[in-house]
Interface confidence: low
């Protein structure tokens, strides 16, 4: 019968010819009267065989990551008569991998989303390297991952790139950040490979700052000869806020001559200050009326970023007109 | 990556009308608020109108109000300028652009469109 | 509206000089909501600054903003060649306005 052991080659080899085993048969007593063949994908360019001894070698640089078995057949023939000495067989050459392979991120570029104040814990995104190294191989395609930038905001799971906010951040003191994260094959050890991916964590506005009057006084005029309904002129606050965040709603907080009311332009979120009823500047020659305003939109949980609304004193003096 | 590409400028009479075009690839449409500007040949850059993200309010430079409406197709990633009584003075090159995510700035721009209104 | 100044018209300088470029507002601009941006001919803008002093993304830092209010600028604090180009500042407190733009050429 045949007798082999399981025939392994490692990849990437750069010798000429390297030793793989030997292939022989049992009936076999070493007199040189055998002659052993080899047949199949690979015999003669990849592998060759000592006819007289069996033993095989590979004579060109292998790839596992290009083909990782190569099936072939053996023969062996007795020299003097030509018939063969045992039934064809068939066997496999496996190639062992070597770590000749680097983590690469697949999916670029990562760009994620993730509210502002979001709490420590909060996930952003998942980061994925793929390593083309046999994973069945000890760890040369066992990855770690890890921060390169991005400290103290976020942090890295290790073995599943999972990427975690670990600061509390404010959109409005930075809206994006850049983050490194670094793929190590070997778990990190020595002779380890890895590639980098850049993520673009963007922070998303939330409702944390109120709006707040640009003046803490304003002076307008109205005619006394002005019909109900006029507009005397605007009031304007700021939000740090963004998009429908920063959307507000003015309002008279104090008017004891109930004289004005206060509209609210939402394209332009400034406050209109409309006149309610006619004034008469012989009746009275100027008016003081406090305004407050308040965001649009403010979720339940946000309420404690909006405890009391910015406030401003407006005066409105009032010009005479000749009476006929 | 974001690429914006501008179309249907030509030479148009003066009265007349013309509809541009803006197709948008490379990141989510839908998610942002889109621009028209223009640039008269050899001048500044002059804002026309904008259009939130998801098409309810439009907003418009006062030399435009009236004759111009901006609308979009989420379904085709398209932005348009619908262009009317075109005057002398629309003669631009007009741009889209995209309002960036965290504010009101530009940072994306197409190529731009020429529109000449001449007799 | 707000009304953007920008000064000087033209700027004239060599590779490797600093640029400085003034833009004034008509009245103030609230949470220094104020971008720049750099057109080449034939070319469409693009930004370089936003929020007054943020950076885009991939512009190189010898771009720097500053200023709130009414008074902003922009500086190229060692010219290349490939900065000569026409410079826009654009606020965006209040709808949208552009100053006239200035033009920073090669000395």
């Known amino acids: 019968g045949w007798v082999w052991n399981q025939f392994f080659v490692p990849e990437e080899m750069n010798t000429t010819s390297h030793h793989i085993g030997q292939l022989r048969s049992d009936l076999d007593n070493g007199n040189n009267s055998f002659q052993y063949k080899l047949l199949g994908a690979g015999a003669g360019s990849t592998f060759i065989i000592d006819e007289r001894t069996g033993d095989i070698y590979a004579i060109q640089k292998l790839d596992r990551e290009e083909r990782s078995l190569y099936i072939l057949r053996a023969q062996v023939i007795d020299i003097a008569t030509g018939r063969a000495v045992e039934p064809e067989s068939e066997f496999v050459i496996k190639v062992s991998d070597i770590n000749d392979n680097e983590p690469k991120f697949l999916d670029e570029p990562y760009e994620a989303i993730v509210p502002e104040m979001s709490p420590e814990g909060t996930l952003v995104i998942q980061v994925t390297a793929s390593d083309a190294d046999d994973p069945s191989s000890g760890n040369n395609a066992r990855l770690l991952y890890s921060l390169l930038q991005g400290q103290p905001y976020f942090s890295v799971e290790p073995t599943t790139g999972v990427i975690r906010i670990s600061s509390k951040m404010d959109r409005e003191l930075q809206d994006e950040y850049w983050v490194i994260i670094q793929a190590k094959d070997m778990i990190g050890q020595p002779g380890a490979l890895s590639g980098t991916t850049s993520v673009l964590i963007k922070l998303s506005d939330v409702n944390d700052n109120k709006p707040i009057f640009k003046e803490s006084l304003y002076r307008l005029t109205v005619s006394e000869s002005a019909p109900t309904g006029t507009s005397i002129g605007t009031i304007m606050a700021y939000d740090n806020d963004i998009g429908e965040n920063a959307e507000m709603d003015y309002s008279i907080e104090e008017d004891d001559s109930q004289t004005f009311d206060i509209i609210t332009n939402h394209e332009t979120q400034e406050g209109i200050v409309i006149l309610k009823k006619k004034v008469d500047f012989e009746h009275q020659n100027h008016y003081g009326i406090r305004a407050k305003v308040k965001n649009h939109h403010v979720p339940e949980q946000l309420m404690k970023y909006h405890t009391e609304a910015s406030t401003t004193f407006i005066k409105i003096q009032v010009e005479d007109v000749d009476e006929p | 990556q974001v690429q914006l590409v501008e179309s249907g400028g030509g030479v148009v009479q003066p009265g007349g009308s013309l509809r541009l075009s803006c197709a948008a690839s490379g990141f989510t449409f839908s998610s942002y608020d889109m621009h028209w500007v223009r640039q008269a040949p050899g001048k500044g850059l002059e804002w026309v109108a904008v259009i939130s993200y998801e098409g309810t309010n439009e907003y418009y430079a006062e030399s435009v109000k009236g004759r111009f409406t901006i609308s979009r197709d989420t379904s085709k990633n398209t932005l348009y300028l619908q262009m009317n009584s075109l005057r002398a003075e629309d003669t631009a090159v007009y741009y889209c652009?995209?309002?960036?995510?965290?504010?009101?700035?530009?940072?994306?721009w197409g190529q731009g469109t020429l529109v000449s209104v001449s007799s | 509206e707000i009304v953007l100044t920008q000064s000087p018209g033209t700027l004239s300088l060599s590779p490797g000089e600093r640029a400085t470029l003034s833009c004034r507002a008509s009245?103030?601009?609230?949470?220094?909501?104020l971008a720049w941006y750099q057109q080449k001919p034939g070319q469409a803008p693009r930004l370089l600054i936003y929020?007054?002093?943020s950076r885009a993304t991939g512009i190189p830092d010898r771009f720097s903003g500053s200023g709130s209010g009414t008074d902003f600028t922009l500086t190229i604090s060692s010219l290349e060649p490939e900065d000569f180009a026409v410079y826009y500042c654009?606020?965006?407190?209040?709808?949208?306005?552009f100053g006239q733009g200035t033009k920073v050429e090669i000395k």
């Open positions: 009245q103030s601009v609230s949470n220094t909501y």
């Open positions: 929020g007054a002093s």
């Open positions: 652009a995209r309002e960036r995510y965290f504010d009101w700035s530009f940072d994306y």
């Open positions: 654009q606020q965006y407190s209040n709808s949208w306005t």
